[in-house]
Amino acid sequence: EKSDYGNLTLAEDTNIGSTILTIQATDADEPFTGSSKILYHIIKGDSEGRLGVDTDPHTNTGYVIIKKPLDFETAAVSNIVFKAENPEPLVFGVKYNASSFAKFTLIVTDVNEAPQFSQHVFQAKVSEDVAIGTKVGNVTAKDPEGLDISYSLRGDTRGWLKIDHVTGEIFSVAPLDREAGSPYRVQVVATEVGGSSLSSVSEFHLILMDVNDNPPRLAKDYTGLFFCHPLSAPGSLIFEATDDDQHLFRGPHFTFSLGSGSLQNDWEVSKINGTHARLSTRHTEFEEREYVVLIRINDGGRPPLEGIVSLPVTFCSCVEGSCFRPAGHQTGIPTVGM
């Protein structure tokens, strides 16, 4: 009915789903048939697909709606052309003419928008032993209006990080520790400089890669180890070592040795596997008392760390396989026999 709907001015933040224009065409064919039904299509001026047209089948009214956000920065003025056509093909020899087309001019006005981060989340991986002042990552944002951006961190509760306000580069300012929990997540804020100081928030996730910073130790409490005295034959016991490092590519491979040379006449230690070793007596001539055997455990890491642990072993008289002590003789009677 109308071929030019004139100018339509909208702010770029107009809600998706909004009806911005009502259009009407007529068809002289029999009502409520495929011949008279009208479909509207935008054929020019909306290559981004920001607009759509819904048709009321009873009235053949078309409603132009916003399908995607309008954007002043990429398309301030658009000359929109749409076509009204039947869902059924026209009879042979009849063509759509100029009256089947209409147009309007969409003018989008600028609205100051917050900066936009290039990613929803920024992730970086860094070894936990990095030197203070090391760059551990960076974030980037752009302001749609082209304003400068200032970056800041929020929620750096461990006090590990600082951000360059201009470049978005993130640096360590304190020793990092994977054992405190990884990933370490903080918020990054981008604020436009000038304008209305609008800001937006993203996240920075720092994944801490383990380094060898925990010395080996005994995997459990080995108090209460005993041998029955006197020994009838050399005896042995098995113990397990562990550490608190994360062994990403293979399990721990500890090596074991006696902690001092003076122990070598009485004891020997032999590796069973990467985590277990056997402590054996070299003879049977031990006194009826507690011996503290020092064991040196090396983790073979980079750098290698060593722990010296003590295994208390008691030689005691036994009754039915358990240590026997006269009443009141001593406290802390060993309970684990080997």
Partner: antibody, heavy 119, light 113 residues
């Protein structure tokens, strides 16, 4: 849509190794972590480990550090898990699962491969 | 490692009833850096792989019916099904995605009477 395709079953001998595959489609493979999860019959879920296909960084559950090795082939958008020195304890369903958008929950799961260790 | 404990291990409910199940964490899952709770819930129907229902403790995965509601903060979390349906018969798992290694609870099995 996102799809993670896994073979249905593998039967292996005790002491042998098996390499499970997970072919991803419907998203950019290098943008998301790939996780592997074990489920024994009638039991809960256990996280084995994860790999970031963008740089092949791996993170393992300590319990599986000597059992599983995770790799990826970015050219075919495929993730792999090799299980070694298999015992009856390794008989289970193994799922691959893609990380979520912006964090580390498991947004998409494969159908799982049933591994049976039997002589 | 963070230990996740789910209860009850199983429960049987009639269609239309309200269901609640609990998940407790051995460590705080609320990040002071982002103010998010890093807890997810999954539904696993018999013979199928798990399907995500909830992440960040209360954010529903797209396509999940709104009868599934995640709540809680810190160490105590709840999955509520406001009006249980026959198709909700499944094993429900919680998982912390706060710190490596990611860990799951033992599961809650929901049966329909």
């Amino acid at each position: 849509q996102v799809q993670l395709q896994q073979p249905g079953a593998e039967i292996v001998r005790p002491g042998a190794s098996v390499k499970l595959s997970c072919k991803a489609s419907g998203y950019t493979f290098t943008d998301y972590w790939m996780n592997w999860v074990k489920q024994r019959p009638g039991q809960g879920l256990e996280w084995i480990g994860a790999i970031d296909p963008s740089d092949r960084y791996t993170n393992y559950n300590q319990k599986f550090k000597d059992k599983a090795t995770l790799t990826v082939d970015t050219s075919s958008s495929s993730a792999y898990m090799q299980l070694s020195s298999l015992t009856s304890e390794d008989s289970a369903v193994y799922f691959c699962a893609r990380g979520g958008y912006g964090d580390y929950w498991f947004a998409n799961w494969g159908q799982g491969t049933t591994v049976t260790v039997s002589s | 490692d963070i230990v996740m404990t789910q209860s009850p291990s199983s429960l049987a409910m009639s269609v239309g009833q309200k269901v609640t199940m609990s998940c407790k964490s051995s460590q705080n899952l609320l990040s002071s850096g982002t103010q998010k709770n890093y807890l997810a819930w999954y539904q696993q129907k018999p013979g199928q792989s798990p399907k995500p229902l909830i992440y960040f403790a209360s954010t529903r995965e797209s396509g999940v019916p709104d009868r599934f509601i995640g709540s809680g903060s810190g160490t105590d979390f709840t999955l509520t099904i406001s009006s249980v349906q026959a198709e909700d018969l499944a094993l429900y798992h919680c998982q912390q995605h706060h710190y490596f290694p990611w860990t799951f609870g033992g599961g809650t099995k929901l049966e329909i009477k």
